[in-house]
């Protein structure tokens, strides 16, 4: 997290806000609900209280405007700048302005007013942008899904550094951003994508370029807004410029940023039995056109060319790949080796000699 220079903050805990005008995109009650919920994000974790005024001067004046709207920080039409807010202080201090050339919504369409407002009110209270891609105060808008919003830990640490904790946090689970060099790090899925490596963990993925050591961290939804926050397995089919992503009983085919029509499909359409609830890992072999799908202690082999499951499967993981354990969290193939991830460990397995040649920490893939 980051606070503003000179640690700008309010010297009182009871703050007022006023909605000066409304967007035509939403009903008045939807707008009021979004702002109320956005303030609650911050009051839940601090001693701050927010009271709405219907007229007069409030600490935080909220308005919608377009282009030049009276503060010499003009908006720019659709997309680009969405909103801005001033840090704590007199006059403009604390005020939040929303660009009415955007389409504001209470859903995933357009820009979600609650999410943008919660971010802006962070500025109104003294938080600057965070470098943590998982933080609400990260400067890039990402719709995080319909489920109950949980303020990320980085934002909690930031706001509590200014105002301290509240009496009781009604939602004490604050998601942490994974640390790539945590020795206990386990991974959810790994796939190549157009020459890069994508390494998934929780609602994030690291993107690793072959010529770089520093992996860049992204929210999965910043790349693919329609995908679930977390995924179970992934593999690339390079000759078709597609990657396949699995979550629960569903899977998606993606071309770059775009989901192919007809997806998601059910994993049973691949020929998996109905009792298989999820795929834990998947890896594709371009030279044979085969894909290994792991679930529980079993492995299936799918023929991507003929779109059928190979006979003689499923088989036990321990029988086909002795020594790697009886489950696979994530897997990928490179230069004749399969890399199996099981908890905080990865096994380098030679396809040619059919044996484990190295055992390494899982996060050595991230150069830790």
């Amino acid at each position: 997290y980051n606070v503003f220079p000179r640690t700008l903050k309010w010297s009182k805990m009871n703050l007022t806000y006023r909605i000066v005008n409304y967007t035509p995109d939403m009903t008045h009650s939807e707008v009021e609900k979004a702002f109320k919920k956005a303030f609650k994000v911050w009051s839940d974790v601090t001693p701050l209280n927010f009271t709405r005024l219907h007229d007069g001067i409030a600490d935080i004046m909220i308005s919608f405007g377009i282009k030049e709207h009276g503060d010499f920080y003009p908006f720019d039409g659709p997309s680009g700048l969405l909103a801005h807010a001033f840090p704590p202080g007199p006059n403009y201090g604390g005020d939040a302005h929303f660009d009415d050339d955007e389409t504001w919504t209470s859903s995933s369409k357009g820009y979600n007013l609650f999410l943008v407002a919660a971010h802006e009110f962070g500025h109104s209270l003294g938080l600057d942008h965070s470098k943590d891609p998982g933080a609400l105060m990260f400067p890039i808008y990402t719709y995080t899904g319909k489920s109950h919003f949980m303020l990320p830990d980085d934002d909690v640490q930031g706001i509590q550094s200014l105002y301290g904790p509240g009496d009781e946090d009604p939602n004490p689970k604050h998601p942490k951003t994974p640390d790539k060099c945590d020795p206990s790090l386990s991974l959810d899925a790994i796939t190549s994508l157009r020459g890069e490596t994508m390494i998934f963990k929780d609602r994030f993925f690291w993107r690793l370029h072959p010529q770089q050591v520093d992996a860049e961290l992204f929210l999965t939804k910043s790349f693919w807004p329609e995908l679930p926050n977390r995924i179970d397995a992934a593999y690339e089919h390079p000759s078709h410029d597609l990657i396949f992503i699995f979550r629960g009983r569903k899977f998606w085919a993606l071309n770059g940023y775009d989901i192919l029509e007809g997806y998601p499909k059910k994993i049973s359409e691949l020929g998996l039995p109905k009792e298989v609830k999820k795929i834990s890992a998947a890896v594709h072999f371009e030279d044979t056109g085969k894909t290994l799908l792991f679930s529980g202690n079993q492995v299936w082999r799918y023929d991507d060319t003929n779109h059928i499951m190979d006979k003689d499967y499923p088989r036990l993981i321990e029988e086909d790949f002795p020594g790697i354990g009886d489950k696979v969290d994530a897997v990928y193939e490179k230069n004749g080796y399969i890399y199996f991830f099981n908890g905080p460990i990865q096994f380098e397995y030679s396809i040619w000699s059919n044996r484990i040649v190295r055992v390494m920490p899982a996060n050595s893939i991230l150069w830790c």
Epitope: P78, S79, I140, Y141, T142, F218, S222, F223, P225, D241, N255, G256, Y257, D258, L260, E261
Partner: nanobody, 114 residues
């Protein structure tokens, strides 16, 4: 319906630069990914660069650091700035909106000579 028209192709020496443009007609351009693909004679069409609706970029390993993709939703235009061009960059470059199942331009020829 989105129509795409590429421009900016041409001939250039090794190490030179070109800027390709992709003009889109149709109001849904801003809601689709914007990509550049290329096809060299006798080869398959290959991905070059892409930019999401949220302006997150993705490059083929062979062009990363040399090519820059950008978009202007208000103008309905996409761009590909190509620097340090190599003879192996010679191809017809196609603009795409929305991925493989989306919309395609007719292409613009880029020739890099040594």
């Amino acid at each position: 319906e989105v129509q795409l028209v590429e421009s900016g192709g041409g001939s250039v020496q090794t190490g030179g630069s070109l800027r390709l443009s992709c003009a889109a007609s149709g109001s849904t351009f801003s809601r689709r990914s914007m990509n550049w693909y290329r096809q060299a004679p006798g080869k398959q069409r290959e991905f070059v660069a892409g930019i999401s609706t949220g302006r997150i970029t993705n490059y083929a390993v062979s062009v990363k650091g040399r090519f820059t993709i950008s978009r202007d939703n208000a103008e309905g235009t996409g761009y590909l700035q190509m620097n340090s061009l190599k003879p192996e960059d010679t191809a017809v470059y196609y603009c795409n909106a929305g991925g493989l199942q989306g919309y395609w331009g007719l292409g613009t020829q880029v020739t890099v000579s040594s």
